[in-house]
């Protein structure tokens, strides 16, 4: 059956032979209606990439550099299955490219000029492409030929396989630049030995190199890693201090109509029958015909790449930056230590309009990028299409798991001038009901619920976390009869109450009328039994404070709070009747952009913050008529975090634990991708 066939692309006679064997052995173990293999032979991996894009083949396994080529237009391929190494219990699908130095040296990443460098080899990922790609814009001009620029940047190097005649400085630490193990400083172990012997000041290797060469922890403690933010960390902190995370070997397919489920079904069955130590007659991860045919011989199996993970996310911002710099050879005109405009991520058109107004008023220091969901915005910040946005705590958690960092906190209670330096305790997550109802915390089953959005703190993580510990399952759509929780599956009962309009029904952005704090409260007013919001929501939308038709006549006394002990209290008493304390919303950014974002925002709030009194004729950063666009409308200022500069420290142990527990109920495709 052609639609059940996966056309595998082979790049040599030997690969084609193994592919045919793969096809025949899979036929013998799979049912006739199951997936099958067909083999397509091409001259090179690049030809395979083009064939897949043209729908002449379906899959091929590629190294990281080729995954980058496959992702570029017009190919637009995506990673669908990753090879893993190590054990099934602790599968490794990536390695980390690191810069190792001796502990007793005192320079940082931005002080490498004039040092001596040790590389694994010319054109190799961890030893050359990544470090030189990331340093590219610091290299002296002209940057072509690249080897000459590198030779002039470092005071001496060992770059195995370089041309020692044309570029003698690249071979200064290893005469001749031998391209095999005859050169004692060749490859990973060699580059590390070059550092260890004192020949070089820095070695560009992979994270495992130091562990493979120094079994003793005391010996390893004599070394450190250089981080991109110009700090250092111990060698075991490579996940937080590396030049790039590099995928090892990946199966790619078309982004649209790519048969990824079929490819996974095929490879999953293949590893069951012909994986490591499974079969004598055919082995997926070895071959009598040659090395690394179709798959790496060192692979132990396959893992499905999460569907939300596109090539940009898979390769990572640092890796793409390095490779793009090397390939395109372009550098910003501005010096790299100067802050470029900050690209703010705006959700849908309401936020985009406010962001545009901010952009005009900031004289272009703020630029705007749009996405339809918060998760899409976080992904854009991860891959460099955007730089920053302000997030509810639930999304600060997801952003943190995806490598972003909190930069500034929204403060709601501290008057100026102390606001900028004050760390507030947070706000209260509350459950609001109509005073006329007889609801309590204990009889919510079967009622109609209103949520700010799935994944947000007051509207979801806190109430659903509490509910989960009571009902011990994730079927919240069965607990409530119906509701509006923007971001739920469209056919879920938790979208039934949403107002839309139609194509935007239940979307987690302002196009859905019941989105956010004000939207969830409106849902309660018009349709629901209980709304999960922040403690300020009722006062901010009653007594004529919200002029919208649905809100202008509402009275605060018509609403009450549900307390966890089964009682109810006035909305004026959130301190004695709340579900939990929630961390304030916070601005997040990539680590490399955090300082610029902080500096710019502090400057912007001095001009457009709460000190502006007339928002009808001046731009106000924290104003959008109860819509909480870009920032919460009740923000007094953006405050420095001081030492609360990681998502764990910012959110606090208790909240992180609560959200981690709720992860078993997670519907976040981005979180799944970021924890892959």
């Amino acid at each position: 059956v052609p639609e059940k066939s996966v056309r595998w692309c082979a790049v040599s006679e030997h690969e084609a032979t193994k592919c045919q064997s793969f096809r025949d052995h899979m036929k013998s173990v799979l049912p006739s209606n199951g997936p099958s293999v067909a083999c397509v032979k091409k001259a090179s991996h690049l030809d395979c990439i083009r064939a897949i894009a043209a729908n002449e083949a379906d899959a091929v396994t590629l190294d990281a550099g080729l995954v980058y080529d496959a992702y570029l237009a017009p190919n637009n391929l995506k990673p669908v299955v990753a090879e893993f190494y190590g054990s099934k219990e602790d599968p490794q699908t990536f390695y980390y490219a690191v810069a190792v130095v001796k502990k007793d040296s005192d320079f940082q990443m931005n002080q490498l000029r004039g040092r001596k460098s040790c590389h694994t080899g010319l054109g190799r990922s961890a030893g050359w492409n990544i470090p030189i790609g990331l340093l590219y814009c610091d290299l002296p001009e002209p940057r072509k030929p690249l080897e000459k620029a590198v030779a002039n940047f470092f005071s001496g190097s060992c770059v195995p396989c370089a041309d020692g005649t044309d570029f003698p400085q690249l071979c200064q630490l290893c005469p001749g630049c031998g391209c095999s193990t005859l050169n004692q400083y060749f490859s990973y172990s060699g580059a590390f030995k070059c550092l260890k012997d004192g020949a070089g000041d820095v070695a560009f290797v992979k994270h495992s190199t130091i562990f493979e060469n120094l079994a003793n922890k005391a010996d390893r403690d004599q070394y450190e890693l250089l981080c991109l933010d110009n700090t250092r960390k111990s060698v075991d902190e490579y996940k937080d201090c590396h030049l790039a995370r590099v995928p090892s070997h990946t199966v790619v397919a078309r982004s649209v109509g790519g048969k990824e489920d079929l490819i996974w079904e095929l490879l999953n069955q293949a590893q069951e029958h012909f994986g490591k130590d499974k079969s004598k007659e055919f082995q997926l991860f070895s071959s009598p015909h040659g090395k690394d045919l179709l798959f790496k011989d060192s692979a132990h199996g396959f893992l499905k790449v999460p569907p939300r993970m596109d090539a940009k996310m898979y390769l990572g911002y640092e890796y793409i930056t390095a490779i793009r710099n090397l390939r395109e050879g372009t550098c910003p005109e501005a010096p790299t230590d100067e802050c470029k405009p900050v690209k703010w991520c705006a959700l849908s058109h309401h936020e985009r309009l406010k962001c545009d107004e901010w952009s005009v008023n900031s004289a272009g220091k703020i630029e705007c990028e749009s996405a339809e969901t918060t998760e899409d915005c976080i992904a854009k910040i991860m891959n460099g299409e955007a730089d920053a946005m302000s997030l509810d705590g639930g999304f600060v958690y997801i952003a943190g798991m995806c490598g972003l960092v909190p930069v500034l906190a929204e403060n709601y209670n501290t008057p100026n001038p102390n606001c900028e330096n004050t760390a507030e305790e947070g706000y209260f997550a509350v459950a609001v009901v109509k005073s006329s109802s007889d609801l309590t915390w204990d009889n919510l089953k079967g009622k109609k619920s209103c949520h700010t959005a799935v994944g947000r703190t007051a509207g979801w993580n806190i109430p659903m976390g509490l509910l989960y510990s009571k009902i011990n399952h994730c079927r919240f759509d069965e607990f409530f009869s119906e509701g509006c929780a923007p971001g739920s599956e469209k056919n879920s009962s938790l979208c039934k109450l949403c107002m839309g309009p139609s194509p935007n029904l239940c979307e987690p952005n302002n196009k859905e009328g019941y989105y956010g704090y004000t939207g969830a409260f409106r849902c309660l007013v018009e349709k629901g039994d209980v709304a999960f919001v922040k403690h300020q929501t009722v006062p901010q939308n009653t007594g004529g404070k919200n002029p919208d038709a649905w809100a202008k006549n509402l009275k605060e006394e018509d609403y009450e709070l549900l307390c966890l002990d089964g009682s109810r209290k006035s909305v004026q008493e959130p301190a004695n009747c709340h579900l939990a304390r929630a961390p304030n919303h916070a601005v997040v950014a990539r680590k490399d952009k955090a300082d610029c974002v902080q500096t710019l925002l502090l400057d912007q709030q001095r001009m457009f913050g709460s000190s502006v009194t007339d928002c009808s004729s001046n731009f106000c950063l924290f104003e959008s008529k109860t819509k909480d666009l870009l920032f919460r409308d009740d923000t007094v200022c953006l405050a420095k975090l001081h030492d609360r500069n990681t998502y764990e420290k910012y959110l606090g142990e208790e909240y992180v634990k609560a959200v981690t527990n709720l992860r078993k109920c997670s519907t976040s495709p981005l979180l799944e991708a970021c924890t892959f």
Epitope: H349, H350, E351, L353, K354, E357, V360, N361, A363, C615, S616, S617, N618, F619, C620, E623, S624, K625, K627, L629
Partner: nanobody, 117 residues
């Protein structure tokens, strides 16, 4: 709500010029920021240029040096002078103000600009 009406569009050859006007009914002096947007067929609406109450301006990169935004508060009018027009400037041009702070997606009829030889 301030009502805005765009005019001045038309068909022009590459390299030519046009001046768009945006007339406001009601006083625009109190409006903080005004802007011109454009939308080409099948594309998202995009900010072209904006002007604050104090007269400071901002332009999208592709029009810098070619377009000039201005406003005349006495006449309740905002302008967009477009020089060295290119085929890629072809779009419907809209003016907007952000005075309501609601940031609703309300737009007028716009004025069609076509750059073609």
């Amino acid at each position: 709500q301030v009502k805005l009406e765009e005019s001045g569009g038309g068909l022009v050859q590459p390299g030519g010029s046009l001046r768009l006007s945006c007339a406001a009914s009601g006083s625009i002096f109190s409006i903080a920021t005004m802007a011109w947007y454009r939308q080409a067929p099948g594309k998202q609406r995009e900010l072209v240029a904006g002007i604050t109450r104090s007269g400071s301006t901002n332009y999208r990169d592709s029009v810098k040096g070619r377009f000039t935004i201005s406003r005349d508060n006495a006449k309740n009018t905002m302008y967009l002078q477009m020089n060295s027009l290119k085929p890629e400037d072809t779009a419907v041009y809209y003016c907007t103000d952000y005075s309501s702070r609601y940031y609703h997606d309300y737009w007028g009829q716009g004025t069609q600009v076509t750059v073609s030889s």
